[in-house]
């Protein structure tokens, strides 16, 4: 037997356990942490990836100014509750019964409360702004080449439909990628912008989630594009609800 052929792996998610125990003995992969079956032909949801991560051993000014309602993920890692489809549950709580509401990318959008806190619906993040600063290079990248390369990356590596990459802005050394996807625009089978952004973030950090693929080697006309810092802003369809205390802090 050829060992490599006679086993199961998940090309799009290395944080899985796979075996030929699906229907008809087909390969079936389950996410670590949750044990949920994942579709290896597309990206795994961010919620299941976070759960798996927690279970693992440990020209003119064109740049966009994030809206006052933009959220940044300051809370870092947590062990999320995911619904049967692998999406974040609207309400998340920790082991000490502290609860908060999250958006569709799992970022907190309310003050923390107790078990009585209600989160009526999972609010969709419809606009993601990925703000990158690249390492110094001999000269600036050509904007249209950079635009084309980043769009290609999101289309080919993350399988995100090109219509969801709204814009690529560049003002050396800052690059901004805007992803937009309303609830009405997202068809069945479409990759979610939140999942694509998370895979991209992990790639940029050198922590690729893809099985056996090399790390991300971003090049613009042969010139390496090396990112030295990343900031991601999340805009929800409904503005977040934080107390004034947080806003003035």
């Amino acid at each position: 037997h050829t060992a490599a052929q006679d086993n199961c792996t998940c090309p799009t998610n290395k944080m899985t356990v796979c075996s030929p125990d699906g229907p008809g003995g087909r390969c079936q992969c389950r996410a670590l942490g949750s044990g949920m079956a994942v579709d290896c032909s597309t990206l795994t949801s961010k919620c299941l990836l976070l759960k798996a991560r927690m279970s693992a051993p440990k020209n003119a000014r064109t740049l966009v100014r994030p809206s006052e309602h933009a959220l940044v993920d300051n809370d870092g890692l947590y062990d999320p509750d995911c619904d049967p489809e692998g999406r974040f549950k609207a309400r998340q709580c920790n082991q000490t019964s502290v609860c908060w509401c999250v958006n569709s990318v799992g970022v907190r959008r309310t003050d923390k409360g107790d078990l009585s806190l209600r989160c009526d619906e999972l609010v969709r993040t419809h606009h993601i702004l990925i703000d990158l600063r690249h390492r110094p290079t001999a000269g600036a990248f050509n904007h249209s080449d950079l635009d084309a390369e980043l769009r290609r990356l999101f289309r080919e590596r993350y399988r995100l439909h090109p219509k969801f990459v709204a814009a690529v802005h560049y003002e050396q050394p800052t690059i901004q990628i805007e992803l937009r996807q309303n609830t009405s625009q997202k068809a069945a089978g479409d990759v979610d912008i939140g999942d694509a952004a998370y895979y991209f973030e992990r790639d940029i950090k050198g922590e690729s989630l893809f099985q056996g693929r090399g790390g991300l080697d971003l090049r613009v006309r042969g010139e390496p594009l090396q990112v030295e810092r990343t900031l991601i802003y999340y805009l929800d369809e409904i503005p977040p609800k934080f107390s004034m205390k947080r806003l003035t802090a």
């Epitope: 075996s19 030929p20 125990d21 699906g22 229907p23 290896c40």
Partner: antibody, heavy 115, light 112 residues
């Protein structure tokens, strides 16, 4: 050694119901995907139902709604519940243990649907 | 449904001689997970089917190495280097890439 023994096949009238059993041994039943495959009198093979390790069930459209695959982990038995039987359901029914396909087959149990 | 077309319907072979059976599918059997869920089975007279080959070319345990499976996409072949008496019976191909899973109609291998 993997052993699969089917039983429950009888002569049944059209519209009737039947429950087939498959006693499994020689492997970890709870970790395995299992299926039922039938062979018509013309010797044509047809996939009938599958159950994955996570107990998700799968059926071809031709039997959906009339056939249910299930299992009893305590007794290591795979079942096939058949209702609203038709003459075209007449076949030898085989239970299989699955790994990249139908890896192991039982000896089969004969179901005849006739008035 | 994916149609699996086997040829020939009957194959008459002299013991010790090679034999080859073809199976063509109506659609590529390469799955999105990179695997090709294609099997060859043999049903000897009066017996249950027994799998010989899985994932196109992998031999099941206990299957003699005179059997070889090859192919990709839509075209697959089973070759027997030297036919022996125990190889007689009906050979079926199967696909598990697309739902519903489907079988070929069979190729009967008989002695000339």
């Amino acid at each position: 050694e993997v052993k699969l023994v089917e039983s429950g096949g009888v002569l049944v009238k059209p519209g009737g119901s039947l429950k087939l059993s498959c006693a499994a041994s020689g492997f970890t039943f709870s970790d395995s995907a299992m299926s039922w495959v039938r062979q018509t009198p013309e010797k044509r093979l047809e996939w009938v139902a599958s159950i994955s390790r996570g107990d998700d069930t799968y059926y071809p459209d031709s039997v959906k709604g009339r056939i249910t695959i299930s299992r009893d982990f305590a007794r290591n038995i795979l079942y096939l519940q058949m209702t609203s039987l038709r003459s075209e359901d007449t076949a030898m029914y085989y239970c299989t243990r699955d790994r990249f396909g139908f890896a192991y087959w039982g000896q089969g149990t004969l179901v005849t649907v006739s008035a | 449904d994916i149609v699996m077309t086997q040829s020939p319907l009957t194959l008459s072979v002299t013991i010790g001689q090679p034999a080859s059976i073809s199976c063509k599918s109506g659609q590529s059997l390469l799955d999105s997970d990179g695997k090709t869920y294609f099997n060859w089975l043999l049903q000897r007279p009066g017996q249950s089917p027994k799998r010989l080959i899985y994932l196109v070319s992998m031999l099941d345990s206990g299957v003699p190495d005179r059997f070889t499976g090859s192919g990709s996409g839509t075209d697959f072949t089973l070759k027997i280097s030297r036919v022996e008496t125990e190889d007689l019976g009906v050979y079926y191909c199967w696909q598990g890439t697309h739902f519903p899973f489907t079988f070929g109609s069979g190729t009967k291998l008989e002695i000339k």
